[in-house]
């Protein structure tokens, strides 16, 4: 298992400070940390040194050292705080994408551990969080919104109390994607149809999904029909409906009708047969 020097879990320095982190292992070692400026890397066999002579708030983060050749996959970590009185937050990403019911980590890292008691999460322009937003905070990692919901796809800011006033981070956009279990659900009504020539008929092709991104079409034999689509949203599902109205059916209307819907997960189709008789 590699060992990091300094041998502390946390290191707090001022902006402009010189910081040296050394990792020693049995074999070659590698550093991984937040993308930040001013670091110089020196490697020498089983040791590797990360060094900066001008630490900035952007160097705040967890630096992990691993030994790629270690079969046990051991690692060591140190968290660096560069406590800049003007910059309480180091935001590592401005867009976070998760699926519904996953935890969403908003990576705003506190640059000074002393400020932890006065942190909060808000939506941009100071708007409060949506009701039932369950979140926690870690100064090393940021805010975690637990079991994120689609409706929580918003722009957020991290807030810290400094000298009695709230200082905000830059905004972080959270995109919560619906978990699409499979292709859209389909209904084709009626299941079968017989009409006398000259009568009216109606065929309804309906598809629904938790996500709006899907296509639906009705085809007669092998011809895709151009039918206006009606869209709706209820019971947390998006619905798209195609209604074919025939005022006076004729023999050319007879045949196989297929309702087809597709999304990123695949395609569903269902068919019915329409018979037209003389009398």
């Amino acid at each position: 298992i590699p060992v990091i020097e300094p041998s502390v879990p946390e290191l707090v320095v001022k902006p402009g400070a010189t910081v040296t982190l050394r990792c020693v292992g049995n074999g070659s070692v590698e550093w991984d940390g937040p993308p930040s400026p001013h670091w110089t890397l020196y490697s020498d066999g089983s040791s590797s040194i990360l060094s900066t002579n001008n630490a900035t708030f952007q160097n705040t983060g967890t630096y992990r050292c691993t030994e790629p050749g270690d079969p046990l996959g051991g690692s060591a970590a140190i968290h660096l705080y560069v406590k800049d009185p003007a910059r309480p937050w180091n935001v590592l990403a401005q867009e976070v994408v998760v699926f519904e019911d996953q935890d969403a980590l908003l990576p705003c890292l506190l640059t000074d551990p002393v400020l932890e008691a006065g942190v909060s999460l808000v939506r941009v322009r100071g708007r409060p969080l949506m009701r039932h937003t369950n979140y926690s905070f870690s100064p090393w990692h940021g805010f975690t919104i637990h079991r994120a919901k689609f409706i929580q796809s918003q722009d957020y800011q991290c807030s810290a109390l400094m000298g009695g006033r709230k200082v905000m981070s830059i905004s972080i956009r959270l995109k919560v994607q619906k978990v699409i279990p499979g292709p859209p659900a389909l209904t084709l009504v009626p299941a079968e149809l017989v009409r006398i020539r000259g009568e009216a008929a109606q065929i309804v092709c309906s598809a629904s999904s938790v996500d709006v991104n899907f296509d639906v079409f009705l085809q007669h034999n092998n011809t895709k029909l151009a039918i206006p689509q009606q869209s709706d949203f209820h019971n947390n599902r998006y619905q798209k409906v195609l209604t074919l109205n025939l005022d006076q059916v004729d023999f050319q209307h007879a045949g196989n009708y297929s309702c087809v819907a597709s999304n990123v997960q695949g395609k569903h189709s269902t068919s019915m047969f329409f018979r037209v008789v003389e009398s």
């Epitope: 300094p6 879990p9 946390e10 400070a17 051991g74 970590a77």
Partner: antibody, heavy 118, light 107 residues
């Protein structure tokens, strides 16, 4: 409020054994690195042993003077750290402090006294 | 192992004076130095970490400086509560050795 409370000190004969305990509260113990430091008039403050967090594989480190004789361990479910001391010598006499490491030895217990004497 | 040499071993000063305690490491410790204060019969308390950073709640009359192998702790305008012993300690790897201490006494 961070609190560290040592126990288990006392009088022991040379060659004997003793186990010190430290009960912690007021912080997330499982994330913490914990150390033992001892103090005597002859040796001053002397670092003894360290055990790191689970994230750091519960790695242990020892002062050369105690290596092979002392064992540091922890029970995260009980928020406790222990120091098992075997083959004790008169020079192991002193006040043993339990400390939490963050940016330094941020928090110290009140200490427990070990006397090794015949 | 890194040795820490602290000086002076003792110091007799009056309230209101300024004192400086120094600590020398046997090799470069890259500013990974802590200072502790210990009052009679009490546990040590962290004063300074990473050579120059004051621990939470430490009065601003205390200041740490230094780099490489040479470090110092300065106390401006000594108060009566500042009397006691002071220790330096490095965090550049293990073993984490302490300095021998400086006893600050009232003149």
């Amino acid at each position: 409020e961070v609190k560290l409370e040592e126990s288990g000190g006392g009088l022991v004969q040379p060659g004997g054994s003793m186990k010190l305990s430290c009960a912690a509260s007021g912080f997330t113990f499982s994330d913490a690195w914990m150390d033992w430091v001892r103090q005597s008039p002859e040796m001053g403050l002397e670092w003894v042993a360290e055990i790191r967090s689970k994230a750091n594989n519960h790695a242990t480190f020892y002062a050369e003077s105690v290596k092979g004789r002392f064992t540091i361990s922890r029970d995260d479910s009980k928020s406790s750290v222990y120091l098992q001391m075997n083959s004790l010598r008169p020079e192991d006499t002193g006040i043993y402090y339990c400390t939490r490491v963050k940016v330094g030895f941020d928090n110290w217990g009140q200490g427990t006294t070990l006397t090794v004497s015949s | 192992d890194i040795q820490m040499t602290q000086s002076p071993a003792s110091l007799s000063v009056s309230v209101g004076e300024t004192v400086t305690i120094t600590c020398r490491a046997s090799e470069n410790i890259y500013s990974n130095l802590a200072w502790y204060q210990q009052k009679q019969g009490k546990s040590p308390q962290l004063l300074v970490h990473a050579a120059t950073n004051l621990a939470d709640g430490v009065p601003s009359r205390f200041s740490g400086s230094g780099s490489g192998t040479q470090y110092s702790l300065k106390i401006n305008s000594l108060q009566s509560e500042d009397f006691g012993s002071y220790y330096c300690q490095h965090f550049w790897g293990t073993p984490r050795t302490f300095g021998g201490g400086t006893k600050l006494e009232i003149k």
